[in-house]
Interface confidence: low
Amino acid sequence: YYGCPSECTCSRASQVECTGARIVAVPTPLPWNAMSLQILNTHITELSESPFLNISALIALRIEKNELSHIMPGAFRNLGSLRYLSLANNKLQVLPIGLFQGLDSLESLLLSSNQLVQIQPAHFSQCSNLKELQLHGNHLEYIPDGAFDHLVGLTKLNLGKNSLTHISPRVFQHLGNLQVLRLYENRLTDIPMGTFDGLVNLQELALQQNQIGLLSPGLFHNNHNLQRLYLSNNHISQLPPSIFMQLPQLNRLTLFGNSLKELSPGIFGPMPNLRELWLYDNHITSLPDNVFSNLRQLQVLILSRNQISFISPGAFNGLTELRELSLHTNALQDLDGNVFRMLANLQNISLQNNRLRQLPGNIFANVNGLMTIQLQNNQLENLPLGIFDHLGKLCELRLYDNPWRCDSDILPLRNWLLLNQPRLGTDTVPVCFSPANVRGQSLIIINVNVAVPSVHVPEVPSYPETSWYPDTSSYPDTTSISSTTELTSPVEDYTDLTTIQVTDDRSVWGMTQAQSG
């Protein structure tokens, strides 16, 4: 037994941690029974031959955040029990062939955040027990055929944040046990068909933030176990008709930030487990009937920031479980009265930043559970009588930035708004646009007799009251309604994939400041 090196701390002798800029070489002597060794934030630039020769019981070795740029081929000799090796966050440009030879127990190898420019089949040919290989954040421009052929037990492979421009269709062919493959933030322009055919157990495929323009029709046909597919922020302009046909387990699909112009009926599905579909920031111009009809369990559908000018009455057929629908920042001028009829469970709808001139009186007829409606910044001059009457759960309605016409026809709406003023929020209230003499005045308090003196104003019709009264003490707590749903893009459930955040969280879903708290 050796004592603990002065530059290190040793807890129970078996766990050794050596940190600090004053360390310029692997400290010695190391306790012979060390099972975990961490060398972090040092000025070590090189690993010589066999610096760990006397600690053959080592199970975990972390050499991270150092100045390490050179490793001798025999640096890890005699570490036959090693199961976890991290060389992440160093300055490695080259790995010597044979570096990992003899590491027969190695299960996790982390080489991320270095400066590696190439890997070769010989690098990993001895690592037959490897389950996790992290290579993200390097400078890899290609992966040679055969590079991973011996890693038949690999379950997780991360090649994100490199400079890959092409992937050979054979490079993953032997990885039948792979569950997670990450290729995000590279320069891939297309993926050859067959590339993923051998990945029959794949559960997560991250391809976002590349330059992929074309998806081969059968690209995912062998990946029946795929649960998470990230295709956002690419250059995809069309989806082959059968592209998603064989993905029954899929529960997360991101397609935002592409160049999609149209969605053909049946393109999605059947995907009984898909809960969220993110399609914002594309170039979609219309939604045909039944385009989402296979997505029976879908709860969140984001179509904002497209160029949608037409929605077919049956576009949302089948979406009986939908809770959130975002259509803001499109080119909608008119909506069919039946377009939302099937959305019995809808809670939040955002239609702001369109060109809506009017709404059919029955537009929300079957959507009794609506809690938030965003209609600001459209071309609305009035709303049909009783359009919101049956919406007993409505707690947020945004109507500002519309050219409201404050003549006698506005009275029913004004009176309803008076009763339900708190639903409008306190940030911005709807104001009259015409006639000119009342422009800019609050629609809620406008005196219609002043607005249109030449018109006889009839007695205020008895507008059916809703279940609300302007007594805030009786309101349910609405501050959390949809507060996180539309604020951010889908956040991936792993820490090393950070490419999906949107610059202005609220701009995707268009939530108000009150909601973003």
């Epitope: 190439q118 070769q120 290609y142 040679p144 055969g146 068909m193 081969s216």
Partner: antibody, heavy 119, light 111 residues
Framework: QVQLVQSGAEVKKPGSSVKVSCKAS????????ISWVRQAPGQGLEWMGG????????NYAQKFQGRVTITADESTSTAYMELSSLRSEDTAVYYC????????????WGQGTLVTVSS | QSALTQPASVSGSPGQSITISCTGT?????????VSWYQQHPGKAPKLMIY???NRPSGVSNRFSGSKSGNTASLTISGLQAEDEADYYC???????????FGGGTKLTVL
Amino acid sequence: QVQLVQSGAEVKKPGSSVKVSCKASGGTFSTYAISWVRQAPGQGLEWMGGITPMFGTPNYAQKFQGRVTITADESTSTAYMELSSLRSEDTAVYYCARGDWYDYHFDYWGQGTLVTVSS
Amino acid sequence: QSALTQPASVSGSPGQSITISCTGTSSDVGGYNYVSWYQQHPGKAPKLMIYEVSNRPSGVSNRFSGSKSGNTASLTISGLQAEDEADYYCQSYANRDNFVVFGGGTKLTVL
């Protein structure tokens, strides 16, 4: 300017082997794929296999698997193609061609080597 | 029997345009953007004219252009000239037992 220079014509007996060489100059040898393509008299082009020297492992067309061996010597920037168990239908011009490792389009070709198999 | 199907011959008069088709499957032409075209004069080695469907190597006339739709690639030669008379081969990367497949070749005659 990249050049691929092949060895000279060969006459072989059926059942024997032939080894054709292809020496590259004027470019990076290791990072490109060298393929072998043959053309029987009056016929079209047929890919036999290829090798990227920096990767080392050759890829062969299924038709030639087990009969062809492709190697590369980085020190001399030379690729070799050996075809065994020759038969008369192997009579052809054999070309070496250079291309990107990932998609095998061939931007430079050797001058061709005529191999005649005759008893 | 070649993996990719080309017409055996096409012809055209000087100044005209001609198109040569190359039909494969979703395992080769349709599945990749890796289609190339080669020109071969008698007794000479092939010369690359188009790569990755529509890219021209430097030195190749802009009279040569390539495109692809579905499982069919096409080579178009505009403003035919006498020196264009040659054999033309298409070639694709393939997701099969072979990395590379060629068409059977098309003999172009300039009338």
